[in-house]
């Protein structure tokens, strides 16, 4: 586990479970239920799932100097997602094919989340907002983007993680 | 009280454009999903938009995708469906709903649309 | 698309009369069924939503049930103001979809 104080995580074995989750978000996308591509809309990203951008310092500059800042922002993406994959959803009708990696997912998820959690530590987490009911009929758009966009933010913190394994462990 | 209020409705031409709106009061706009049904003149319901909460979700109908737009500013309690390349069959009163959760549980007054040349 | 097939399209009734309206899913809509009423000039309101909860405010007179894809609107005594014209609308799968309505008529 990380340690209070801004010490290093467990970057081996963040590595390990972030690369797990990138094979079943993989997994997951396709079982969500048929998703005609029409239905997708015109917007690429959205504000209404995290993204890792720019600014969050897990580049290997940011990583080098506070990697505090990219983790932290991680964190809040992975509790983000992990209400997100717990909700009505993806726990409602339609129901989820039965061997669907969904729950897989979620407790992946959660996980991560704790390894990278300090004991008796809480970073603030940054207003996740709560989520509005969703009716049958919205919800295969919603888990189709909501597992898109799950994809590219765990791809993105199993590179942090790789490089963090393979540069920052002691 | 819980009040949905459309505006921007009226007689365009054919190809023409209209933006409608929808004010709300009496709840958390920003908690809900939104949707816009219209209904032609002496005939049914028919659902034509849908956004989730915080507007990054949308969903058309078929008969209005690629020509309509559906967006809100939670800031302002509002929400929009832009109306672009309009035909005689969009015709109809439009009314905002708010999707509660299990049905569209509050609706406005409606606002009527008129495309005639 | 899922059709919502309605009937009648309409009906004569009497004040005090029971009343009953179907709608049939072309599918397996589980219980995502509403019903809603609509007067002349006015927008829809929420009667009945998920097969059979009464909306608030709604009369006790107003009852829904299911059999498979076959749904039912009850009005056990009709009233003045219960004539108009009733809905129904699944919110399964997109697109929510409408019965084409069936207007109530004072006989």
């Known amino acids: 586990r990380a340690v209070p104080g801004g010490s290093s995580p467990a970057w081996t074995q963040c590595q390990q479970l972030s690369q797990k989750l990138c094979t079943l978000a993989w997994s997951a996308h396709p079982l969500v239920g048929h998703m005609d591509l029409r239905e997708e809309g015109d917007e690429e990203t959205t504000n209404d799932v995290p993204h890792i951008q720019c600014g969050d310092g897990c580049d290997p500059q940011g990583l080098r100097d506070n990697s505090q800042f990219c983790l932290q922002r991680i964190h809040q993406g992975l509790i983000f997602y992990e209400k997100l994959l717990g909700s009505d959803i993806f726990t409602g009708e339609p129901s989820l094919l039965p061997d669907s990696p969904v729950g897989q997912l979620h407790a992946s998820l959660l996980g991560l989340s704790q390894l990278l959690q300090p004991e008796g530590h809480h970073w603030e987490t940054q207003q996740i907002p709560s989520l509005s009911p969703s009716q049958p009929w919205q919800r295969l758009l919603l888990r189709f983007k909501i597992l898109r966009s799950l994809q590219a933010f765990v791809a993105v913190a199993a590179r942090v993680f790789a490089h963090g394994a393979a540069t920052l462990s002691p | 009280e819980v009040q949905l209020l459309e505006s921007g409705g009226g007689l365009v031409q054919p190809g023409g454009s209209l933006r409608l709106s929808c004010a709300a009061s009496g709840f958390t706009f920003s908690a809900y999903s939104m949707t816009w049904v219209r209904q032609a003149p002496g005939k049914g319901l028919e659902w034509v938009s849908g956004i989730y909460s915080s507007g990054g979700f949308t969903w058309y109908a078929d008969s209005v995708k690629g020509r309509f737009t559906i967006s809100r500013d939670n800031s302002k309690n509002t929400l929009y469906l832009q109306m672009n390349s309009l035909r005689a069959e969009d015709t109809a009163v439009y009314y905002c709903?708010?999707?509660?959760?299990?049905?569209?549980?509050?609706w406005g007054q409606g606002t009527m649309v008129t495309v005639s040349s | 698309d899922i059709q919502m097939t309605q009937s009648p399209s309409s009906l004569s009734a009497s004040v005090g009369d029971r009343v009953t309206i179907t709608c049939r899913a072309s599918q397996s809509i589980s219980g995502y069924l509403h019903w809603y009423q609509q007067k002349p000039g006015k927008a829809p309101n929420l009667l009945i939503f998920?097969?059979?909860n009464l909306h608030s405010g709604v009369p006790s007179r107003f009852s829904g049930s299911r059999s498979g894809t076959d749904f039912t609107l009850t009005i056990s005594s009709l009233q003045p103001e219960d004539f108009a014209t009733y809905f129904c609308?699944?919110?399964?799968?997109?697109?929510?979809?409408f019965g084409h309505g069936t207007r109530l008529e004072i006989k």
């Open positions: 709903a708010r999707v509660g959760l299990w049905a569209f549980d509050i």
């Open positions: 998920a097969t059979s």
């Open positions: 609308q699944q919110s399964f799968s997109t697109p929510p979809t």
